[in-house]
Interface confidence: medium
């Protein structure tokens, strides 16, 4: 069965200064490749977290993404402000050469 990206929460309400937990799970380990989180979809979407690389000081992962069989890609975003409002998408990439290719979005 083809991998599905599941974001179970339709909305998350968070007070300013608090931490938001954005839940995301994958239904399969295949295809191999990283997860990335974006705010917004389509052109101009903003990268929030990249499992593979980058520096995202406000973001922590809920589980240990380095574990081989991990399928929980939930994240926490700290110190929420009104500017963080928006729709967040958990996106699975398929490992590719030279670059990973977008595979499926929550």
């Amino acid at each position: 069965e083809e991998l599905q990206v599941i974001q179970p929460d339709k909305s998350v309400l968070v007070a300013a200064g608090e931490t938001a937990t954005l839940r995301c799970t994958a239904t399969s380990l295949i295809p191999v490749g990283p997860i990335q989180w974006f705010r917004g979809a389509g052109p101009g979407r903003e990268l929030i977290y990249n499992q593979k690389e980058g520096h995202f000081p406000r973001v922590t992962t809920v589980s240990d993404l380095t574990k081989r069989n991990n399928m929980d890609f939930s994240i926490r975003i700290g110190n929420i402000t009104p500017a963080d409002a928006g729709t967040y998408y958990c996106v699975k990439f398929r490992k590719g050469s030279p670059d990973d290719v977008e595979f499926k979005s929550g």
Partner: antibody, heavy 122, light 107 residues
Framework: QVQLVQSGAEVKKPGSSVKVSCKAS????????ISWVRQAPGQGLEWMGS????????NYAQKFQGRVTITADESTSTAYMELSSLRSEDTAVYYC???????????????WGKGTTVTVSS | EIVLTQSPGTLSLSPGERATLSCRAS???????LAWYQQKPGQAPRLLIY???SRATGIPDRFSGSGSGTDFTLTISRLEPEDFAVYYC????????FGGGTKVEIK
């Protein structure tokens, strides 16, 4: 061949708003991204925001959040960019550009309008 | 925000010479999401390269793009008179940002 035709030049007072239109012809409108980019005199290119008409919602550059509104009318294949609370620094050429297909991620700007000059002066 | 830094600011060359323009990103950008544009005075930008190395429709093969990660290059193998213009790189991986531009002028 897709063409983007923009509305004419505008002269506006500080504090007012401007609405620029961009009409697409010769191709599918609804499923392709339309972006707005501005260029102040002698300066570089600055992205303001984008919309895919079939989705209806726009993404905006943080700098313009709350001051710019991008909309699209599928019935007339026209996109609009409205910028409010104008100041002299908003004097620029405003371009619309068509990007990639909604189902993909090729959001480079392949087709551009000729630009609309907006002058903000008291 | 991903910042793109282009160098040099100005490149003075003669027709027939090779032009090498650099674009450096403040953080890694998938090469699938990098484009190059050409702009002449009084005109709208024109797409040259997308996906770091794919030529847009109608773009002559003297234009080529390369690079990955944080370092990207636009090469014009032999400058023609119509190639003297300003060139911008752009990333569309996280939001959109443009580099400051490189002006290619006649020496």
């Amino acid at each position: 061949q897709v063409q983007l035709v923009q509305s004419g030049a505008e002269v506006k007072k500080p504090g007012s708003s401007v609405k620029v239109s961009c009409k697409a012809s010769g191709g599918t409108f609804s499923s392709y991204a339309i972006s707005w980019v501005r260029q102040a005199p002698g300066q570089g290119l600055e992205w303001m925001g984008s919309i895919i008409p079939i989705f209806g919602t726009a993404n905006y550059a943080q700098k313009f959040q709350g001051r710019v509104t991008i909309t699209a009318d599928e019935s007339t294949s026209t996109a609009y960019m409205e910028l409010s609370s104008l100041r002299s620094e908003d004097t620029a050429v405003y371009y619309c550009a068509r990007g990639g297909y909604a189902a993909g991620t090729d959001y480079y700007m392949g087709v551009w309008g000729k630009g609309t000059t907006v002058t903000v002066s008291s | 925000e991903i910042v793109l830094t282009q160098s040099p600011g100005t490149l003075s060359l003669s027709p027939g010479e090779r032009a090498t323009l650099s674009c450096r990103a403040s953080q890694s950008v998938s090469s699938s999401y990098l484009a190059w544009y050409q702009q002449k005075p009084g005109q709208a930008p024109r797409l040259l390269i997308y996906g770091a190395s794919s030529r847009a429709t109608g773009i002559p093969d003297r234009f080529s793009g390369s690079g990955s990660g944080t370092d990207f290059t636009l090469t014009i193998s032999r400058l023609e008179p119509e190639d003297f213009a300003v060139y911008y790189c752009q990333q569309y991986y996280s939001s959109y940002t443009f580099g400051g531009g490189t002006k290619v002028e006649i020496k």
